[in-house]
C-alpha cells in the first residue's frame, strides 16, 4: 500500500525458508541434521516406499483443516504398518465363515514392537483394499471384545465402483486398548449392515487378502495388499524428551 | 516490552470493541443498528427464549474449533425450530408400532416457511429429549425414502443415564432434500441397532413425546419438549444481497 | 555466450547488480549485502558492527523481554553474556560455545571482541568487553559492577549475596 | 476463499497464499531427507486493512469485514487457514524412517 | 495451549488470550440486542518471536519453535485458535429473531 514500506518478497521467502529449517528439526526433536554416515548405498527398501506412499495417499485424502494442535501433535509422528495375520493362521478356524462377515486378526506383539506404550499412539487406521463392487453396500466394523462377543465401532456406505479403492477406518482407541491389554491376538470383523426387518444380509464387497485360489505370483502381490494397520506414533526416545519438558515455555 | 514501543492495552481493547461493532452489523448485513420503534413492550416471548436457550446450549456443547469459513458462513444465521407432528396424527397409523423403532414426522410446509430455499439452509439438527436409560443402547437413525423403504443416516451409542439428556443428529442434507422435493410430510425412524446374529432388538430408550397416558398438564410440557428440527438458515433478504455480491472483493 | 543479465533484468535484484561472465553470471552486491553461495543472488550481511538488542536467555517464557542491552554488536552480545541477538523479537541465536561458529564470531574467546580500528602487525587487536558498561543495570542489580579481564564482578552490600541466575544482589535469608 | 486456486491465478495484493516450493537440497543444503526431494510449503502475505467502524455505518465498509477483518481483531494479520501434513523419509543410522510432520503445507490464508 | 485456563491465570507477556467482556449497552451504546446483555469476546495479544535458525542449531532454541513459531512463518503473529459462536436475540419491526453469529468468542490463541 502506498504508505507502507514495500514488502521485500525475497526477504520474506528467505525468512520463511529459514523458519522451515528450524521447524523441521524442531518437529523431529533434532538439534542438527542427522548424521548420514551409516546410510547404506542404494535405493530405499520397497517396504519403506510403500509405507511412504500409503502415508502420502492418506494426506491427499485428508481435508486440509487446521486442528488446534496440542503440544504432542506438533512433533513428528513415526509411521509404521502391521499387516493382518495371514488367513491360513489357525485363529481364523475358530470363527465360522459366514456370508455376512469377514474377520481380520493382528498380532499384538508386532503392534507393541511398533508402539511400545499406548500413550505414544496418536493415530491408528485399519486399511482395507476393496475390490470392484457391483451394488451399493452398507458395512459395519466390529472389534473382538470378549470370548465370543463383538463391539460395534463404525459403519460405511460403499458406493458401487469399477476400480479397487482403499478404505480407511479410524481405530485409534481400539489399538490403544489392545496395547494396554495382555492379549496376543486381537481382531476386527467387517459385516454387512443388518436391518431389523431385512433378511438379505450378505457381505457383497470383496476385500483383498480373502479371496482364494490365486496364481502363486499374484497371491504374493495380493498378500502384500492385505488389510493392515497404519500406525502413527511418537517414537519412544522423543516421548521421553517430551515428558521432561512438560513445564510451560 | 522493554525495547519496543509499549503496547497500549486500552487502545487495543478500544480497537477490538470498535471492530466488533462493525463485525456484528456486518454479519447481520445491517448498515446501521435496526430501528426499535416497533418493539412491543414486555419480556421476550417464552418460545423465543426457549429457542435462544436451545441455541446457546448447542454452542456450549460444541467443540471450540475454527472451521475454514466459506463466505456464506461468515454471515449470521437465523435460528428457528419446527416441532414434530403430534403422535395422534393419522400419518403414524400407517407405520405399525414395533418394539424396535419409533417414528417422527414433520410438516414440510412449516419447514418451507422457515427456510424458503434449500440453498439457504446451513444446518439442520434433529433434537430428541431422551429420558433416563438403564442399559447401554445402540440406536440408528433412518430417513423415510420411498413408499416403504428407509435410508440409513447415522448411529449413536447411548450410555446409561439417570437424567434426561438432549440428543442431536445432524440432518442438514436430508432437510435440504425435503425442501427441494414436493412431499407434504417427511419423516425419520429411530431404531435399535440390529446385529446379524442377535435376536434381542428392542428399542430400550425412552424418547420424550412418545409415552402415553400422562396427566393433562404434564402432557403439555411433555409435548413442548417433543422431537424438533433446529434450523439455521440465511434469511431470504440477506441471501439476495449475497448473490449480488458474488464477485471477488 | 548467452548474456543472462540482459535476458532477465531482475537477476540479482533488489540488492545487487548482474555481471555477465562467459557461460554464466555473478551478482555484484550492494553495500551491506553479500553474494549467496552460488553467486546468483545477494543476501544481507549481519555485520559485526550492526547494533541491536542482546537477549539474556531462552529459558524465560518472556525472552523477548529479557533484554540485556539495546545497542550492542553481535560480538559484544554473543562473545559475552548473550544467548541471542536481534531486534523486535527477531532473534539470531548466539552460536554454542566451543563450536566452529563461535570461534569464527569470537576468535579471541569469551569476554573479548576484535577492534578493527586498532591493528597490530596487520591483525585486528582484541579488546576486553566491558560488561558493566554494556549491561551494568541488568547484570548487577542492587550492587556495584566491576569490569575484569575477561568478565566482570558484582559486589553486593553487606547482608546480600550475588545470585548468578537472577543477576542481582539478594538478601541473605538469616 | 484465499486459497491456492484463487491466489495463484490472481494478482491479489491483499492477504493471500503465495507460492513457495522448497527444494531441500538447493534451499536448505540438506541431503538427509530422502523423500520427498522438496515440497510446496507456500506462505501467507498481504495486508488486512483495519476498518474503524464508526456509527455512520454503510454497506460498502461493512462488506469489507468479511475478507479483511472477519475476526474483528484490533490488528488483523494474514495467517494460514487450511494446512496439510508432510510425510518424509530419512535415515537414523542404517534404519530408514517414515515420519509425518503436521501442518507443513499452507493451502489457504485468512485475515485473523 | 494458550487458552483461557492458562492465560487468564498467568502473567504471560508473549502471545496469549486476553480477557475482554463486551457490554452491548456500555461499550457499544446499543440497546437493540435483547439477549445476551453482553459476552466474553476476549482477544489475542503478545509477541511471537521469530528465531533465525542458523545451522548452529541447538535444542534450547529449537524447543521454542513449538510455541513461538510452530507454523514457521516469516513474521509470526498472535491470532485466535479456538473460536465459539454467539447466539443473539433482536427485533426486526415487531418480530423477535434468534440469530447465531459464528466465530465471535476467542477461547485460545496461537502464533501463526
Amino acid at each position: 500500500l502506498s504508505t507502507c514500506k514495500t514488502i521485500d518478497m525475497e526477504l520474506v521467502k528467505r525468512k520463511r525458508i529459514e523458519a522451515i529449517r528450524g521447524q523441521i528439526l524442531s518437529k523431529l526433536r533434532l538439534a542438527s541434521p542427522p548424521s548420514q554416515g551409516e546410510v547404506p548405498p542404494g535405493p530405499l527398501p520397497e517396504a519403506v516406499l510403500a509405507l511412504y506412499n500409503s502415508t502420502r495417499d492418506r494426506v491427499a485424502g485428508e481435508s486440509a483443516e487446521p486442528e488446534p494442535e496440542p503440544e504432542a501433535d506438533y512433533y513428528a509422528k513415526e509411521v509404521t504398518r502391521v499387516l493382518m495375520v495371514e488367513t491360513h493362521n489357525e485363529i481364523y478356524d475358530k470363527f465360522k465363515q459366514s456370508t455376512h462377515s469377514i474377520y481380520m486378526f493382528f498380532n499384538t506383539s508386532e503392534l507393541r514392537e511398533a508402539v511400545p506404550e499406548p500413550v505414544l499412539l496418536s493415530r491408528a487406521e485399519l486399511r482395507l483394499l476393496r475390490l470392484k463392487l457391483k451394488v451399493e453396500q452398507h458395512v459395519e466394523l466390529y472389534q473382538k471384545y470378549s470370548n465370543n462377543s463383538w463391539r460395534y465401532l463404525s459403519n460405511r456406505l460403499l458406493a458401487p465402483s469399477d476400480s479397487p479403492e482403499w478404505l480407511s477406518f479410524d481405530v485409534t482407541g481400539v489399538v490403544r486398548q489392545w496395547l494396554s491389554r495382555g492379549g496376543e491376538i486381537e481382531g476386527f470383523r467387517l459385516s454387512a449392515h443388518c436391518s431389523c426387518d431385512s433378511r438379505d444380509n450378505t457381505l457383497q464387497v470383496d476385500i483383498n487378502g480373502f479371496t482364494t485360489g490365486r496364481r502363486g505370483d499374484l497371491a504374493t502381490i495380493h498378500g502384500m495388499n492385505r488389510p493392515f494397520l497404519l500406525l502413527m506414533a511418537t517414537p519412544l526416545e522423543r516421548a521421553q524428551h517430551l515428558q521432561s519438558s512438560r513445564h510451560r515455555r | 516490552l522493554s525495547t519496543c514501543k509499549t503496547i497500549d492495552m486500552e487502545l487495543v481493547k478500544r480497537k477490538r470493541i470498535e471492530a466488533i461493532r462493525g463485525q456484528i452489523l456486518s454479519k447481520l448485513r445491517l448498515a446501521s443498528p435496526p430501528s426499535q420503534g416497533e418493539v412491543p413492550p414486555g419480556p421476550l416471548p417464552e418460545a423465543v427464549l426457549a429457542l435462544y436457550n436451545s441455541t446457546r446450549d448447542r454452542v456450549a456443547g460444541e467443540s471450540a474449533e475454527p472451521e475454514p469459513e466459506p463466505e456464506a458462513d461468515y454471515y449470521a444465521k437465523e435460528v428457528t425450530r419446527v416441532l414434530m407432528v403430534e403422535t395422534h396424527n393419522e400419518i403414524y397409523d400407517k407405520f405399525k408400532q414395533s418394539t424396535h423403532s419409533i417414528y417422527m414426522f414433520f410438516n414440510t410446509s412449516e419447514l418451507r416457511e422457515a427456510v424458503p430455499e434449500p440453498v439457504l439452509l446451513s444446518r439442520a439438527e434433529l433434537r430428541l429429549l431422551r429420558l433416563k436409560l438403564k442399559v447401554e443402547q445402540h440406536v440408528e437413525l433412518y430417513q423415510k425414502y420411498s413408499n416403504n423403504s428407509w435410508r440409513y443416516l447415522s448411529n449413536r451409542l447411548l450410555a446409561p443415564s439417570d437424567s434426561p439428556e438432549w440428543l442431536s443428529f445432524d440432518v442438514t442434507g436430508v432437510v435440504r432434500q425435503w425442501l427441494s422435493r414436493g412431499g407434504e410430510i417427511e419423516g425419520f425412524r429411530l431404531s435399535a441397532h440390529c446385529s446379524c446374529d442377535s435376536r434381542d432388538n428392542t428399542l430400550q430408550v425412552d424418547i420424550n413425546g412418545f409415552t402415553t397416558g400422562r396427566r393433562g398438564d404434564l402432557a403439555t410440557i411433555h409435548g413442548m419438549n417433543r422431537p424438533f428440527l433446529l434450523l439455521m438458515a440465511t434469511p431470504l433478504e440477506r441471501a439476495q444481497h449475497l448473490q449480488s455480491s458474488r464477485h471477488r472483493r | 555466450d548467452i548474456d543472462e543479465c540482459s535476458q532477465d533484468p531482475s537477476l540479482c535484484l533488489p540488492h545487487g547488480a548482474c555481471k555477465n561472465l562467459q557461460g554464466s553470471y555473478v551478482c555484484v552486491c550492494d553495500e551491506g549485502f553479500t553474494p549467496t553461495q552460488d553467486q546468483h543472488g545477494c543476501e544481507e550481511v549481519e555485520q559485526p558492527h550492526h547494533k541491536k538488542e542482546c537477549y539474556l536467555n531462552f529459558d524465560d517464557t518472556v525472552f523477548c523481554d529479557s533484554v540485556l542491552a539495546t545497542n550492542v554488536t553481535q560480538q559484544e552480545c554473543c562473545c559475552s553474556l548473550g544467548a541471542g541477538w536481534g531486534d523486535h523479537c527477531e532473534i539470531y541465536p548466539c552460536p554454542v560455545y566451543s563450536s566452529a561458529e563461535f570461534h569464527s564470531l569470537c576468535p579471541d574467546g569469551k569476554g573479548y571482541t576484535q577492534d578493527n580500528n586498532i591493528v597490530n602487525y596487520g591483525i585486528p587487536a582484541h579488546r576486553d568487553i566491558d560488561e558493566c558498561m554494556l549491561f551494568g543495570s541488568e547484570i548487577c542489580k542492587e550492587g556495584k559492577c566491576v569490569n575484569t579481564q575477561p568478565g566482570y564482578e558484582c559486589y553486593c552490600k553487606q547482608g546480600f549475596y550475588y545470585d548468578g541466575n537472577l543477576l542481582e544482589c539478594v538478601d541473605v535469608d538469616e | 476463499a484465499l486459497d491456492t486456486n484463487y491466489c495463484f491465478s490472481s494478482t491479489e495484493k491483499n492477504c493471500c497464499v503465495r507460492q513457495l516450493y522448497i527444494d531441500f537440497r538447493k534451499d536448505l543444503g540438506w541431503k538427509w531427507i530422502h523423500e520427498p526431494k522438496g515440497y510446496h510449503a507456500n506462505f501467507c502475505l498481504g495486508p488486512c486493512p483495519y476498518i474503524w467502524s464508526l456509527d455512520t455505518q454503510y454497506s460498502k465498509v461493512l462488506a469489507l469485514y468479511n475478507q479483511h477483518n472477519p475476526g474483528a481483531s484490533a490488528a488483523p494479520c494474514c495467517v494460514p487457514q487450511a494446512l496439510e501434513p508432510l510425510p518424509i523419509v530419512y535415515y537414523v543410522g542404517r534404519k530408514p524412517k517414515v515420519e509425518q510432520l503436521s501442518n507443513m503445507i499452507v493451502r489457504s490464508c485468512k485475515c485473523s | 495451549a494458550l487458552d483461557t485456563n492458562y492465560c487468564f491465570s498467568s502473567t504471560e507477556k508473549n502471545c496469549c488470550v486476553r480477557q475482554l467482556y463486551i457490554d452491548f449497552r456500555k461499550d457499544l451504546g446499543w440497546k437493540w440486542i435483547h439477549e445476551p446483555k453482553g459476552y466474553h469476546a476476549n482477544f489475542c495479544l503478545g509477541p511471537c518471536p521469530y528465531i533465525w535458525s542458523l545451522d548452529t542449531q541447538y535444542s534450547k532454541v529449537l524447543a521454542l519453535y513449538n510455541q513461538h513459531n510452530p507454523g514457521a512463518s516469516a513474521a509470526p503473529c498472535c491470532v485466535p485458535q479456538a473460536l465459539e459462536p454467539l447466539p443473539i436475540v433482536y427485533y426486526v419491526g415487531r418480530k423477535p429473531k434468534v440469530e447465531q453469529l459464528s466465530n465471535m468468542i476467542v477461547r485460545s490463541c496461537k502464533c501463526s
Partner: antibody, heavy 119, light 107 residues
Framework: EVQLLESGGGLVQPGGSLRLSCAAS????????MTWVRQAPGKGLEWVSA????????YYADSVKGRFTISRDNSKNTLYLQMNSLRAEDTAVYYC????????????WGQGTLVTVSS | DIQMTQSPSSLSASVGDRVTITCRAS??????LNWYQQKPGKAPKLLIY???SLQSGVPSRFSGSGSGTDFTLTISSLQPEDFATYYC?????????FGQGTKVEIK
C-alpha cells in the same frame, strides 16, 4: 573448509604391503562415510573401497577383496587403507574422498598419493 | 556388478558450443548417477549428483538428466575452463562403478 590429505604412497615390490592414510579436517569426520578411489596412469577412475561413519560397515571392489582393508580412527580424523599382497596392476594414484550424506556421491577429494608396485 | 558405458570416449568442441555426454547403465539404477570433472594432474570434482542435482558452487551451465539406464550430462555453453575429462558413476549399489570417461578437447 573441507580438506583431505593423503599420505603413505611410494614404491613397493609385488607381494609387499603399504598403508595409506588420509587426514581430514573442516567437517565432523564421524558423520560421514569415506571412500578410496584409484586411477592407474593414463586410465580412468576405479572405485576401491568405502567405510561407514562409525567404521561398522565396509565395502570393497572385487579386485581388492581379501587383500585390502579399509579402516578409520574417528578420534584422529583419519582414514586408512592397508594394502597387502600388492600386484603391478595396483599401481595408481589413490584418492580418498568424502561420501556425501547418504547418497554415495563423492563430494570432496584429496589430491591423491601415488603407489607404484614394481620389482 | 553394474557396468557403466560412456559415449563418446572423446570429443572436440569450441568455446560457446553446447556439449552432450551420455552414460548408459547395464541395469536400471533409478536416479543414482553422479558426474565428475577431472583436469590433468588434479583430483576429480563432483558436478552433478542424483542424475540432475547441481552440486553447490558448480556453474549453472552444467545440467544432468535421465533415469533408469540412460543419462546425459549437458554443458550449455562450453567455457575454456571446461576442457577436461568427465566421468559418470553409479551409486545404486556397491561396488560403485565409473564410466571409462569422456575427454572434451579444444577443436
Amino acid at each position: 573448509e573441507v580438506q583431505l590429505l593423503e599420505s603413505g604412497g611410494g614404491l613397493v615390490q609385488p607381494g609387499g604391503s603399504l598403508r595409506l592414510s588420509c587426514a581430514a579436517s573442516g567437517f565432523t569426520f564421524a558423520d560421514y562415510a569415506m571412500t578410496w578411489v584409484r586411477q592407474a596412469p593414463g586410465k580412468g577412475l576405479e572405485w576401491v573401497s568405502a567405510i561407514s561413519g562409525t567404521g561398522a560397515h565396509t565395502y570393497y571392489a572385487d579386485s581388492v577383496k581379501g587383500r585390502f582393508t579399509i579402516s578409520r580412527d574417528n578420534s584422529k580424523n583419519t582414514l586408512y587403507l592397508q594394502m597387502n599382497s600388492l600386484r603391478a596392476e595396483d599401481t595408481a594414484v589413490y584418492y580418498c574422498a568424502r561420501v556425501s550424506s547418504g547418497h554415495w556421491d563423492f563430494d570432496y577429494w584429496g589430491q591423491g598419493t601415488l603407489v607404484t608396485v614394481s620389482s | 556388478d553394474i557396468q557403466m558405458t560412456q559415449s563418446p570416449s572423446s570429443l572436440s568442441a569450441s568455446v560457446g558450443d553446447r556439449v552432450t555426454i551420455t552414460c548408459r547403465a547395464s541395469q536400471s539404477i533409478s536416479s543414482y548417477l553422479n558426474w565428475y570433472q577431472q583436469k590433468p594432474g588434479k583430483a576429480p570434482k563432483l558436478l552433478i549428483y542424483d542424475a540432475s542435482s547441481l552440486q553447490s558452487g558448480v556453474p549453472s551451465r552444467f545440467s544432468g538428466s535421465g533415469s533408469g539406464t540412460d543419462f546425459t550430462l549437458t554443458i550449455s555453453s562450453l567455457q575454456p575452463e571446461d576442457f577436461a575429462t568427465y566421468y559418470c558413476q553409479q551409486s545404486y549399489s556397491a561396488p560403485f562403478t565409473f564410466g571409462q570417461g569422456t575427454k572434451v578437447e579444444i577443436k
